[in-house]
Interface confidence: medium
């Protein structure tokens, strides 16, 4: 399922993007899944749809629920789901885990903390930053565009950082806050020729015709911050976007993890409603970085249904 978790605080703005991709010319319809009620597009509404975006201006706890977006093109429809949770504002300083965005790591050389989700909003500088609820002061902290730079990072700089900004919609201002943890690495990083952990080279993956299948391309690139690292899928040597089969989609965005200190990425290829012709394709997991490119190939085979007869 193309589903995405989104969360926000009551009385703040929340903007959610449809997890399914489409060209700007495609129309996107939004529905509240529980009631199948269409979300209006008129901006006078507190909750309204604007193309790929669903806007809560401001959000209320009662808005929580699953929203369906359908991207419509002349030849196909794609459905996505946004699981939205709106929380009451906390009276104390602690930010609970369920409100935290992904943790970022920094080192003496690289100490940027990006403000999560800010690109979805119509905001203007300055961006306000807080650490453990205290406003950041001093020349070591520099708010630059959508990120915070910390000079001469020390282990004491680890903690929870909150960015606060104002979203403007048709002259009305709405507050937005987002928090993420920052950890400090003191070890020196390094870069390796990409190592693909999955799939195995020339792996045969069994699939059932008519069912959905997922292939994960997972690779590690070294230790610490990597200037260039990417994983992606190709079909018969063609980019997924150029292959032209809407049933086969590369998951938007790459998940980054630090496994045993290693910088690793994975990218999921989702095949909906597997067809016979999918078994004829060559699926290539590609991992690349500063050193070069490595490829592992996967082919699909039909999973034989279990024979229940004696």
């Amino acid at each position: 399922k193309f589903s995405k978790q989104s969360w926000g605080l009551e009385n703040e703005a929340l903007i959610v993007r449809c997890p399914r991709q489409g060209k700007p010319s495609y129309t996107v319809d939004w529905y509240y899944s529980q009631t199948n009620k269409s979300i209006p597009t008129q901006e006078r509404n507190r909750v309204f749809a604007s193309g790929q975006l669903l806007k809560f201006l401001p959000a209320a706890v009662a808005d929580s629920g699953i929203y369906t977006c359908i991207v419509r093109s002349p030849t196909f429809n794609r459905t996505g789901y946004a699981n939205v949770t709106i929380y009451k504002k906390q009276s104390d300083c602690n930010v609970p885990d369920y409100l935290m965005y992904s943790t970022v790591s920094g080192s003496e050389k690289n100490s940027k903390i990006y403000c999560p989700t800010i690109d979805l909003y119509n905001w203007t500088a300055p961006l306000e930053w807080f650490k453990n609820c205290q406003a950041l002061q001093g020349s070591r902290y520099r708010a630059h565009k959508s990120f915070l730079v910390i000079d001469n990072v020390m282990t004491e700089d680890a903690g929870d950082y909150t960015c606060k900004f104002i979203h403007n919609e048709n002259g009305a201002n709405y507050s937005v806050t987002a928090t993420r943890s920052f950890t400090v690495k003191d070890e020196q990083g390094f870069s390796l020729f990409p190592v693909i952990g999955a799939p195995a080279q020339n792996e045969i993956k069994e699939v059932e015709i008519g069912k959905n299948a997922n292939l994960t391309c997972s690779a590690c690139f070294g230790k610490g911050t990597q200037f260039l690292a990417a994983v992606l899928w190709q079909l018969n040597g063609t980019k997924i976007t150029d292959f032209g089969e809407p049933r086969i989609q590369q998951e938007e965005g790459q998940n980054q993890s630090f496994s045993n200190g290693l910088a690793c990425l994975d990218m999921v290829l989702r095949i909906a409603d597997v067809k016979e012709e999918d078994l004829l394709l060559q699926y290539d997991c590609l991992a690349l970085n500063l050193h070069g490119l490595r490829r592992h190939t996967v082919r699909l085979s039909r999973k034989n249904p279990i024979d229940h007869h004696s």
């Epitope: 020729f193 992606l232 190709q234 040597g237 050193h291 070069g292 490829r295």
Partner: nanobody, 122 residues
Framework: EVQLVESGGGLVQPGGSLRLSCAAS????????MGWFRQAPGKEREFVAG????????YYADSVKGRFTISADNSKNTAYLQMNSLKPEDTAVYYC???????????????WGQGTLVTVSS
């Protein structure tokens, strides 16, 4: 192997701009990665910027973020590096690199151009 030819280098004053081009002899529509690296005198070759063919995701070294922009025009088999607000420390030989999908190979090093010199000085 792809033949890569860089152009657009030259002498420019601090704060000035240059646009480097990298022309590929073969098609780059299937290029998985095209990028720019640079090597200053007495230093190691370092990554500057890269673009991934699938989706056009771009990557930049911290030292050039916000000043340099990489792009590719597949119809012209060319990659570009727009360099603004140039500093003396940007002085180096700039190399174009490409890694293309080749079905018969599982490990690919990059194909490299010969390089073009960029000098930033008043």
């Amino acid at each position: 192997e792809v033949q890569l030819v860089e152009s657009g280098g030259g002498l420019v004053q601090p704060g000035g701009s240059l646009r480097l081009s990298c022309a590929a002899s073969g098609t780059i529509t299937s290029a998985v990665f095209m990028g720019w690296f640079r090597q200053a005198p007495g230093k190691e070759r370092e990554f500057v910027a890269g673009i991934i063919g699938s989706g056009g995701a771009t990557y930049y070294a911290d030292s050039v973020k916000g000043r340099f922009t990489i792009s590719a025009d597949n119809s012209k088999n060319t990659a570009y590096l727009q360099m603004n607000s140039l500093k003396p420390e940007d002085t180096a030989v700039y190399y174009c690199a490409a890694s293309r999908y080749a079905r018969e190979r599982d490990v690919h090093a990059y194909d490299w151009g010969q390089g073009t010199l960029v000098t930033v000085s008043s």
